[in-house]
């Protein structure tokens, strides 16, 4: 007997479905309706089909009832072609309900969205989390994704993409966007991180991270915020190959005075980098290769720094700066 | 079983931040469910303060939103509430609970705010 | 929010006899085939305790006397025939939308 395509929790939580055979029963996700969280999973399914059953240009208001009952905060939606006209559609319906937070991954998305109607609400999200989604549009698809949405979004995340790099000038500001994660796109790379960070698109960001992005040098990263007026308060580098040198026909970059955590853990590091932020609260220096102790003149001026992980520390022995962090033991780097 | 206990400090400083940590035992807090604080002044009602999911995903109640931040340790199995600026209206005992029907309750600690 | 509004504030039955406590939501807290109201007892010093959940359904090792009913906005407790442990301040909940929200409580007390 094949598996139920749907699983719901016992306490009406989470609700998972993973529609894996060629033709799915979809009426099996109604089990759904009274999940907070749901989690979807085409199977690499073709959606087209979809378009011929439903009217993409059906008014949304008359579902509004419907789906302000669903109780659903946190929605996955994973493996699929979806054509543009049927994603419109959806955040369109779903911009009745209490969804939160939206989660895209594993998808390709055909053909080009529509416009915004102007008697259309937005879908007023929280977070939004795409891995590995591709779009026919190119790098025009932000903007085209963005204007579905109302101005409140507080968290984006942008893994796999395809075009990482954004049409800045068909971009709206993101007013309340604190978080931004472009990690997990290798190809990035300091130069596709100032076409991405589009210059004055994102004033209010507070944490940035760019963990395995192709990073080069913190310095370069300084130079790419900095073009882009951009000034977090928090920022992960980690989990990139980093150089300790800087160039030294680079302009030097005077880091913003916003910034007061940096992580540069797992960046294959065999000395403290130049051109670090003069002054830290927080400095995350674990499982690199420093083969001695930094030196008081190699490093800003820290609260908490973290070198745990590294080959000059034998377990047990003190930290040699003052307000370390240190477990004692080496952790698996 | 799904076992819940809650540890901190029992008296904090008016204006300071107030630190509590729920240890779960029997059951893993990234399987599935919500992960609450509840609180309960002195003689009086129950409050929700918030979740953590099995996700990640966080929600807080609104009155209380600008002050609160749930986070977790998955390797540890535990789920912390911190609450900014605390005032006397803060005391309570504040209970860890599994789910959105509260069906698993830790004991509870009373936290006192006070100089 | 969803206010939950219990009635009575407290309440004295005699042993063996039947106790009913109402709850009222100020907007519905069904989602589709389910009402999301729950039902606590608590004791002092003690956390509170499920009885009931989404409306009428008995939790696990809940006596039977105990029993809920309701729809939409309007919610009872009954407990058939009031035993001497039965003792308690009783709290509906709501777990429809958030923020999840409690009633004000029932003292339920021995005539």
């Known amino acids: 007997t094949t598996p139920e395509p749907c699983e719901l929790d016992d306490e009406d939580f989470r609700c998972v479905c993973n529609f894996s055979e060629p033709q799915p029963d979809w009426s099996e996700a109604f089990q759904c309706v009274s999940a907070v969280e749901v989690e979807i999973h085409a199977g690499g399914l073709n959606l087209e089909p979809f378009l011929k059953r439903v009217d993409a240009d059906a008014d949304p208001r008359q579902y509004a009832d419907t789906v302000k009952a669903l109780r659903v905060r946190r929605l996955t939606v994973g493996a699929a072609q979806v054509p543009a006209q049927l994603l419109v559609g959806a955040l369109r319906v779903l911009a009745y309900s209490r969804l939160k937070e939206l989660t895209l991954e594993d998808l390709k998305i055909t053909g080009t969205m529509p416009p915004l109607p102007l008697e259309a609400t937005g879908l007023a999200l929280s977070s939004l989390r795409l891995r590995n989604v591709s779009w026919a549009t190119g790098r025009s698809w932000l903007a085209e994704l963005q204007q579905w949405l109302k101005p409140g979004l507080k968290v984006l995340s942008i893994a796999q993409a395809h075009s990482p790099a954004f049409s800045c000038e068909q971009v709206r500001a993101f007013p309340a966007l604190t978080s931004l994660d472009l990690s997990d796109n290798p190809g990035l790379g300091e130069r596709g991180l100032m076409a991405a960070l589009c210059p004055h698109k994102f004033p209010a960001i507070q944490n940035l991270a760019l963990r395995n992005t192709g990073m080069e040098t913190p310095t370069g990263v300084c130079a790419a915020l900095a073009a882009a007026g951009v000034q977090p308060h928090s920022l992960d580098l980690s989990h990139n190959s980093l150089r300790a040198t800087v160039n030294p026909s680079a302009p030097r970059c005077m880091w913003s005075s916003a910034l007061n955590s940096l992580n540069l853990s797992f960046a294959g590091l065999e000395q403290v980098p130049k051109g670090l932020p003069a002054k830290l609260r927080v400095l995350d220096l674990s499982c690199n290769r420093l083969n001695r102790a930094p030196q008081p003149d190699e490093l800003p001026e820290v609260d908490n720094l973290t070198l745990d992980g590294n080959p000059f520390l034998v377990p047990g022995t003190a930290l040699p700066h003052e307000g370390s962090m240190n477990s004692g033991v080496v952790p698996a780097c | 079983q799904v076992q819940l206990q809650e540890s901190g400090p029992g008296l904090v400083k008016p204006s300071q931040t107030l630190s509590l940590t729920c240890t779960v035992s029997?059951?893993?807090?990234?399987?599935?469910?919500?992960w609450n604080w509840i609180r309960q002044p002195p003689g009086k009602g129950l409050e929700w303060i918030g979740y953590?999911?099995?996700?990640?995903?966080?929600s807080y109640n609104p009155s209380l939103k600008s002050r609160v931040t749930i986070s977790r340790d998955t390797s540890k199995n535990q789920f912390s509430l911190k609450l900014s600026s605390v005032t006397a209206a803060d005391t309570a005992v504040y209970y860890c609970?599994?789910?959105?029907?509260?069906?698993?309750w830790g004991q509870g600690t009373l936290v006192t705010v006070s100089s | 929010d969803i206010v939950l509004t219990q009635s009575p504030d407290s309440l004295a039955v005699s042993l063996g006899e039947r106790a009913t406590i109402n709850c009222r939501a100020s907007?519905?807290?069904?989602?589709?085939?389910?009402?999301?109201l729950h039902w606590y007892q608590q004791k002092p010093g003690q956390p509170p305790k499920l009885l009931i959940y989404?409306?009428?359904n008995l939790q696990s090792g809940v006596p039977d006397r105990f029993s809920g009913s309701g729809s939409r906005t309007d919610f009872t407790l009954t407990i058939s025939s009031l035993q001497a442990e039965d003792v308690a301040v009783y709290y509906c909940?709501?777990?429809?939308?958030?923020?999840?929200?409690f009633g004000q409580g029932t003292k339920l007390e021995i005539k």
């Open positions: 609970v599994r789910g959105l029907r509260f069906a698993y």
């Open positions: 029997g059951y893993s807090i990234t399987s599935d469910s919500a």
């Open positions: 953590i999911s099995y996700s990640g995903s966080t």
């Open positions: 907007e519905s807290v069904d989602s589709y085939v389910n009402s999301f």
């Open positions: 989404r409306a009428s």
């Open positions: 909940q709501q777990s429809n939308e958030d923020p999840y929200t």
